[in-house]
């Protein structure tokens, strides 16, 4: 029975004279992986990666087609005609074979260039929101604080002056809400199937990959 | 149109080493890999290992490890196989070959290259 | 290691016959074979790559089948020209591995 799934990086568009990765993974499997083919749009052979043979790069693509990551597979030099779809072949042992499809979008250098002016200022006002809603948690949270501390000071001095010798215990505050973290996901479950070399660079690719929310602020709230 | 010329027989002392060329032409040299196989008198084909044109890397029959070493010179589209501490198990029709656009066949074949090893 | 059978080790037939030789290998090697043709004193020349795909110049006479483990070379119309002795070869793992050869003789 094929218990496995092929995650692909789906959708994706780059600029015309660019490189872009395409990669599958094979996951929900023990299936030792036997080879990888990468087939274009029209079927025609782009690589084969054999486990035991290496890397075969179709002959006219060997100027511009690099293998990996893993065993994914590098286009460079990006043209309007690589536009299209690209699938991944998994030939495994016991499973048998799964298919992957990637979508490849090529854009034109001006229409890339257009977008990018779009989104570079949405970017920044965004980052900009973040920042300031950010600052405005850390400056209530330290304001919080600094009452709490003042109540808790003249309470202390005026038990203190009582001499009780009672000890009034002080719950230990949360950390600071509003902290800013850098989140960074690599894929779970990867390699699952692969080992050495080619399971490593698979790591260093997810790990290069990783989103990375731009300050994106983590709100941290006690209940009970 | 795709050629792949070798060098001449070779006739060698067990323990002695032979190097054999295969100068190809009528195509990119560094696009392919290249291919050894030999042939012994009146047997089957063995393939020996590759190497690829472009970046050097090789790949060899576990059974030729250490016994075969494969070389390229791209600026005049030559490959090389050297043989090392020759036996007369080791004389056969060595064939350079040019690999497949689609995998690891063996596309355009050289004519052969005979090396015996006798004392 | 993939091994690589083939049958029979060699036939007698005529010109205009229909001849088929078959090529077993140990374990699924997919589509992963080739056929090639050798002549006395000759360098073996590919036939068939991919079980089934005929390289440019191969007369269409040849032609290829099978997958998995089971695979087949015919020769529609058997010619002068095509006496000869032929090999499958796997490509699917390392060491690529040769079948015995099939001899083709005039009957």
């Known amino acids: 029975m094929m218990t496995g799934t092929i995650e692909t990086t789906g959708n994706i568009s780059a600029k015309k004279g660019g490189s872009v990765i395409l990669q599958c993974h094979l996951s929900s499997t023990m299936a030792q992986v036997t080879q990888v083919n990468w087939e274009q749009h029209d079927h025609s052979l782009l690589a084969i990666r054999n486990a035991e043979l290496g890397w075969h790069i179709y002959p006219a693509f060997k100027d511009r087609v690099a293998p990996g990551p893993g065993l994914g597979l590098t286009l460079q030099s990006l043209t309007m005609n690589d536009t299209g779809e690209y699938f991944c072949t998994y030939h495994t042992y016991p499973d048998g074979t799964y298919r992957g499809r990637i979508f490849l979008e090529v854009l034109e250098s001006s229409v890339a260039e257009h977008s990018a002016r779009f989104q570079i200022p949405l970017l920044g006002a965004m980052a900009m929101m973040l920042v300031v809603i950010c600052i405005a948690v850390i400056v209530v949270v330290v304001l919080a604080r600094k009452k709490k501390s003042l109540r808790i000071h003249s309470v202390e001095s005026g038990l203190q002056r009582k001499s009780t010798g009672q000890e009034e215990q002080i719950p230990s505050a949360p950390s600071p809400p509003g902290s800013c973290v850098q989140a960074e996901a690599a894929p779970a479950g990867l390699c699952g199937e692969q080992q050495g070399d080619d399971c490593a660079e698979l790591h260093d690719y997810f790990n290069v990959l990783s989103y990375r929310s731009l300050g994106s602020c983590s709100f941290f709230t006690e209940t009970g | 149109q795709v050629q792949l010329v070798q060098s001449g027989a070779e006739v060698k002392k067990p323990g002695a080493s032979v190097k054999v060329s295969c100068k190809a032409s009528g195509y990119t040299f560094t696009r392919y890999s290249m291919y050894w196989v030999r042939q012994a008198p009146g047997q089957g084909l063995e393939w020996i290992a590759f190497?690829?044109?472009?970046?050097?890397?090789?790949t060899y029959n576990q059974r030729f490890r250490g016994k075969a070493t494969l070389t390229v010179d791209t600026s005049i589209s030559t490959a090389y196989m050297e043989l090392s501490r020759l036996r007369s198990d080791d004389t056969a029709v060595y064939y350079c070959?040019?690999?497949?656009?689609?995998?690891?066949?063996?596309?355009?074949w050289g004519q052969g290259t005979l090396v015996t090893v006798s004392s | 290691d993939i091994q690589m059978t083939q049958s029979p080790s060699s036939l007698s037939a005529s010109v205009g016959d229909r001849v088929t030789i078959t090529c077993r290998a140990s374990?699924?090697?997919?589509?992963?074979l080739s056929w090639y043709q050798q002549k006395p004193g000759k360098a073996p020349k590919l036939l068939i790559y991919?079980?089934?795909s005929l390289p440019s110049g191969v007369p269409s006479r040849f032609s290829g089948s099978g997958s998995g483990t089971d695979f087949t070379l015919t020769i529609s119309s058997l010619q002068p020209e095509d006496f000869a002795t032929y090999y499958c070869?796997?490509?699917?793992?390392?060491?690529?591995?040769f079948g015995q050869g099939t001899k083709v003789e005039i009957k």
């Open positions: 991919n079980a089934k």
């Open positions: 374990q699924s090697i997919y589509s992963y």
């Open positions: 190497i690829d044109a472009y970046s050097g890397g090789s």
């Open positions: 070959a040019r690999g497949g656009d689609y995998g690891w066949y063996l596309g355009v």
């Open positions: 070869q796997h490509h699917y793992g390392n060491p690529l591995t």
